[in-house]
């Protein structure tokens, strides 16, 4: 059993059928000796007496708040959580696995620069009694600041029968510099609590690895004299490391008709302005790209052919 | 430590076209590393972190470019008092601290260099021939110390007496490719930067 | 299955003209970009240019502006290379080659070898 | 026009053998690089696009890499079947231009 916060702990179980459970001592925070007696949520029937209680947590019927009273006061809580541990594996009910980049991902996190600050967002069907607390820091041993603000319900949307929730929260390295070399890793630590039950939930990565520049802006076309050509201009988005001559970006622009089946244009370049040729009903799009560090690309920014 | 005395090529072109150059051949090699020796810890999660250059050269505070002086976070080393006393950058050229920068990232490819071609010594005597290193990647960290132009003694290839852990070996490998390709990274950053300057 | 189909060797005299033709099937050529490529005896590869079937426009190499026109008819689902002035340096194999994308080629025809005597 | 130069212009080898060819561009072309391949008395096809891109239908054994000026083409473990031409493309800027090509032969 460990302290999560003031008041609630955590209970860490072996989760298989006749488990014998753990055996938890709880101490009423009170200098009161006699007449203590101890409830369960919200209860009455009297579970023991005296400042302490000893219980067997096997299940999460044995979980929950606890309260010790003297003649009618309530003295101190407790609020017992339940971590369960199946064949040796902590359990991952709460988020949903995003399978992206690889399985048992959870948490995604993204960054629009070099700045040290990043966006992690997590998936899950669960709608209530759910609370989130965020930590994080560059490296474990000796751990460096990175502060994170309260995660956030971010979107909700409907995939089959089912309602999926996405929080997200934003954090920011304490002391970054951008053109710095990461030896250390960001490591990111999410506790869930759904009801009774606790799960947590880490993810390790460099900035460099999660970059994902914001989409090129201000695009703008120019059509060539006597040509089916124009020439696509754009700009660095504004979110981008600056300066743009030391954090450099790649760029693709595609020409993409309404149907899969239509002709298309691609080409790669590493000016903010192409020749491309454009087609009735077609619009060009441009995506943006760190150009010595290959992470991913932006999403496209789009503009109509006509 | 006594830098070594700089005439830096006039024409910065040259020396990003070598810098392009590395970056393709470090990442080249990288890969081709992780894909031949997949049965070791060789991604960027699996292995640590390690600096060979670390407390010997500067590359990243030297190279800092003008704007990022008045960030607090990139001024942790003493070396870079001199960018923000000195008004000598704005013209750039051939100025004490571009000097200073290239000096920093000649000495990064000569460590490199030396680590390297001690590695493929040992890599050529294991009987399971497994991997080698890329004559391409070693011809071009040799064309980018000649296009920086410096003149600096050169260091001794280690020569080592005991018998090879080639595991180890290529493990350590592992750790210098990702670390050189970090370094590329960096290294292609300044010379666009100075190239636009 | 994609096939090409590309009209027989041609033996012209100098200044003479030709009509290449170029047939597709398992692909409609309304969908794609047609180029044509020229290869010359030593085996260097000249791009002529594209013509886009949907809408008969065209863009060529500056080289062969004044020596090739491109048509197609989509009725027939065939793309044609006209060669005007013909000398010895058109002495080659034409290949048509249609694209998703009029930046490379996807497909090549099997080629049509022009010969052009003096 | 951008140039395309392609080493070597023969390169011979034996099968089982790893191989690199070279494409030079006279200008950057960033990523807007494609390699064919040219057997005796066939027409060209497409393996690579845009440097790296790998084509269905195509060997594994064909891969691309390079960005810029300088790219290559790597044939790993070369099979008696790879023998012939092999031209890169440019596609930045029309008029698309190929190199003068590599001869894969025998030893």
């Known amino acids: 059993i460990w302290e999560l916060k003031k008041d609630v702990y955590v209970v860490e179980l072996d989760w298989y059928p006749d488990a014998p459970g753990e055996m938890v001592v709880l101490t009423c925070d009170t200098p009161e000796e006699d007449g203590i007696t101890w409830t369960l949520d919200q209860s009455s029937e009297v579970l023991g007496s005296g400042k302490t209680l000893t219980i067997q947590v096997k299940e999460f019927g044995d979980a929950g708040q606890y309260t010790c009273h003297k003649g009618g006061e309530v003295l101190s809580h407790s609020l017992l959580l339940l971590h369960k541990k199946e064949d040796g594996i902590w359990s991952t009910d709460i988020l949903k696995d995003q399978k992206e980049p690889k399985n048992k991902t959870f948490l995604r996190c993204e960054a629009k620069n070099y700045s040290g600050r990043f966006t992690c967002w997590w998936l899950t069907t669960i709608s209530t009694d759910l609370t989130f607390s965020v930590k994080s820091s560059r490296g474990s041993s000796d751990p460096q600041g990175v502060t994170c603000g309260a995660a956030t319900l971010s979107a909700e949307r409907v995939r089959g029968d089912n309602k999926e929730y996405e929080y997200s929260v934003e954090c920011q390295e304490d002391s970054a510099c951008p053109a710095a070399e990461e030896s250390l890793p960001i490591e990111v630590m999410v506790d869930a609590v759904h009801k009774l039950k606790y799960e947590n939930y880490t993810s390790s990565f460099f900035i460099r690895d999660i970059i994902k520049p914001d989409p090129p802006k201000n695009l703008q076309l120019k059509p060539l004299k006597n040509s089916r050509q124009v020439e696509v201009s754009w700009e660095y988005p504004d979110t981008w490391s600056t300066p743009h001559s030391y954090f450099s970006l790649t760029f693709c622009v595609q020409v993409q008709g309404k149907s899969k089946r239509e002709k298309k244009d691609r080409v790669f370049t590493d000016k903010t302005s192409a020749t491309v040729i454009c087609r009735k009903n077609a619009s060009i799009s441009v995506r943006a790209q760190d150009r010595y560090y290959s992470s991913s690309w932006s999403e496209w920014a789009s503009v109509p052919c006509s | 430590r006594n830098l070594p005395v700089a005439t830096p090529d006039p024409g910065m072109f040259p020396c990003l076209h070598h810098s392009q150059n590395l970056l393709r051949a470090v990442s080249n090699m990288l890969q081709k590393a992780r894909q031949t020796l997949e049965f070791y810890p060789c991604t960027s999660e699996e292995i640590d972190h390690e600096d060979i250059t670390k407390d010997k050269t500067s590359t990243v505070e030297a190279c800092l470019p003008l704007e990022l002086t008045k960030n607090e976070s990139c001024l942790n080393s003493r070396e870079t008092s001199f960018i923000t006393n000195g008004s000598c950058l704005a013209s750039r050229k051939t100025s004490f601290m571009m000097a200073l920068c290239l000096s920093s990232i000649y000495e990064d490819l000569k460590m490199y260099q030396v680590e390297f071609k001690t590695m493929n010594a040992k890599l050529l005597m294991d009987p399971k021939r497994q991997i080698f290193l890329d004559q391409n990647m070693l011809a071009v960290i040799d064309e980018l110390m000649q296009a920086l132009n410096f003149n600096s003694e050169t260091v001794p290839q280690k020569s080592s007496l005991e018998e090879p852990d080639f595991y180890k070996t290529k493990i350590k490998l592992c750790i210098l490719l990702h670390a050189f390709r970090i370094r590329a990274v960096t290294i292609d950053r300044v010379m666009s930067y100075l190239n636009a300057s | 299955e994609v096939q090409l189909q590309q009209s027989g060797a041609e033996f012209v005299r100098s200044g003479a003209s030709v009509k290449l033709s170029c047939t597709a099937s398992?692909?409609?050529?309304?969908?794609?970009?047609i180029h044509w490529v020229k290869q010359r005896p030593e085996q260097v590869l000249d791009w002529i240019g594209w013509?886009?079937?949907?809408?008969?426009?065209?863009e060529y190499a500056p080289r062969f502006q004044d020596k090739a026109t491109m048509t197609a008819d989509t009725s027939s689902n065939t793309a044609y290379l006209h060669l005007s002035s013909l000398t010895s340096e058109d002495t080659a194999v034409y290949y048509c080659?249609?694209?998703?994308?009029?930046?490379?080629?996807?497909?090549w025809g099997q080629g049509t070898t022009l010969t052009v005597s003096s | 026009d951008i140039v395309l130069s392609q080493s070597p212009a023969t390169l011979s080898v034996t099968p089982g053998d790893s191989v690199s060819l070279s494409c030079r561009a006279s200008?950057?072309?960033?990523?807007?690089l494609h390699w064919y391949q040219q057997k005796s008395h066939e027409s060209p096809r497409l393996l690579i696009k845009?440097?790296?891109q790998s084509i269905s239908g195509i060997p594994s054994r064909f891969s691309g890499s390079g960005s810029g000026t300088d790219f290559t083409l790597s044939i790993n473990s070369v099979e008696t079947e790879d023998f012939g031409m092999y031209f890169c493309?440019?596609?930045?800027?029309?008029?698309?231009?190929f190199g003068a090509g590599t001869k894969l032969e025998l030893k």
């Open positions: 845009y440097t790296s």
């Open positions: 398992g692909l409609n050529i309304k969908d794609y970009y």
């Open positions: 080659n249609p694209g998703e994308l009029a930046r490379y080629f996807d497909y």
């Open positions: 013509i886009d079937p949907e809408n008969g426009y065209s």
């Open positions: 493309q440019q596609s930045i800027s029309w008029p698309l231009t």
């Open positions: 200008q950057s072309i960033s990523k807007n």
